[in-house]
Each structure stands twice: as structure tokens, then as C-alpha cells.
Amino acid sequence: TPEVWVQVRMEATELSSFTIRCGFLGSGSISLVTVSWGGPNGAGGTTLAVLHPERGIRQWAPARQARWETQSSISLILEGSGASSPCANTTFCCKFASFPEGSWEACGSLPPSSDPGLSAPPTPAPILRAD
């Protein structure tokens, strides 16, 4: 069964800067990745970035740099201040559209016990199936 993992890290040097890493553990070919915050995309969440392997990348503030790390994982750097700044309990979600598995989404946030600069382990988060 495919899985999606989400890792959230707050940068020690910039407390309003977050790095989100997401990956897809499956055998299919990824056709689109959507990163959102505040909940799943389409369920109250706000899109931060969309990554298409053959057309490119689109991002919205406070996203600063979205990029593919591997064929099946991405990273997103967020920078914010004031109202657009993420906070420690913000939920980030990644949705992977893949053939033939369909769409798989997982969400994660910074663990309450995390010190700045420490990261949550990249374990698969609860998975939402969204066909």
C-alpha cells in the first residue's frame, strides 16, 4: 500500500522559517504534488505550492522555494512574518497524485516538544485517500 510521509522542521536561525519535506512511498509515477497548510487541500487548507514533474513549479507566499528532491520527494521552504507567518502548531499537508495508485495525502506539524532546528522524524503520517 502506498504511503506519504511528511516532515516539518523549524530553522534554528530563523524562527519564522519552516522546511517541509514530503515523500511518496509507492511504485507509481507521480504526476502532481500539492502542498497546503491549515488542513488538507480542498478541506479548508490553503495551497502553498504545486509541483508538476513535466511542467514546473508554482508557489504562493509565504512559500519561498519549492523543489523536487528526488523523483518521489519534495521540499518547501516557508518564510513569513506577521499574519502570513506559520506557527509551531500549523498543519502542513502533502498530496501526491500518482498513476496507477491514485491520490494520497498526509499531514504533519512540528511536534510540540521540538526545539528550533530539530525535525520531526519522517515517519508516514496518517494517510488520507482522496481519489
Partner: nanobody, 118 residues
Framework: QVQLVESGGGLVQAGGSLRLSCAAS????????MGWYRQAPGKDRELVAT???????KIVDSVKDRFTISRGDAKNTVSLQMSSLKPEDTAVYFC????????????WGQGTQVTVSS
């Protein structure tokens, strides 16, 4: 399918300047990396310079002091400013785009001829 259209090639004397431009048909997504390669007669195609959508630049040492690359204000445009041109810069210059930065799908322009006469 992303289309790349180049312009700005031509004939120039040694020591002169040229500016090459390339525009992509993709207007919704940012292409992660765009760049320029060149192919001289009888030689392999070689990298000249690349730039990511966030502004990270790579320029080969042989042209680093003479060429600059930039992304335009319009989405997915890239320019190569070439100065102090030398006869050995004569080549067909190709615009290149890699939307993901992973090489999964790479697009090429048709090429524009640059000829530097001595």
C-alpha cells in the same frame, strides 16, 4: 508540451556583444531551471549557463567573466548576455528547460546561430 523560442543570434566581430533571449510557452508553472547550451561544428553540445526560478546561477568557467544569465520579468524567459566574444564562441546556442530540475523531462529550443568573426 513546453515550447522554447530563441532569438538574438547573429554575426558579430570579435570583442563584440550579443544578447540571446528565450521564451517558454509555459505560463502557469515556473520552470525550475532554464539555461543555455552550445554546440560548435564537429563538437558535442556543452553547458554554458543555467539559472533556477529562485535565481541560483551556474556558469561554466570558460565564459564566467564574459557571459551573464538572467531570468526575465515575464515568467519563464531567460537571457544570455555575451560580451568580449571570441571566434571560439561560434556555435549554435540552444535554450534548455528542465521543469523539475531532475531531468525527468527536458525541453530544447531549435537553436540560434552565433558567429564571431575575427
Amino acid at each position: 508540451q513546453v515550447q522554447l523560442v530563441e532569438s538574438g543570434g547573429g554575426l558579430v566581430q570579435a570583442g563584440g556583444s550579443l544578447r540571446l533571449s528565450c521564451a517558454a510557452s509555459e505560463t502557469y508553472f515556473d520552470l525550475y531551471v532554464m539555461g543555455w547550451y552550445r554546440q560548435a561544428p564537429g563538437k558535442d553540445r556543452e553547458l554554458v549557463a543555467t539559472i533556477t526560478y529562485t535565481g541560483s546561477i551556474k556558469i561554466v568557467d570558460s565564459v564566467k567573466d564574459r557571459f551573464t544569465i538572467s531570468r526575465g520579468d515575464a515568467k519563464n524567459t531567460v537571457s544570455l548576455q555575451m560580451s568580449s566574444l571570441k571566434p571560439e564562441d561560434t556555435a549554435v546556442y540552444f535554450c534548455n528547460a528542465d521543469p523539475s530540475g531532475l531531468g525527468r523531462k527536458v525541453y530544447w529550443g531549435q537553436g540560434t546561430q552565433v558567429t564571431v568573426s575575427s
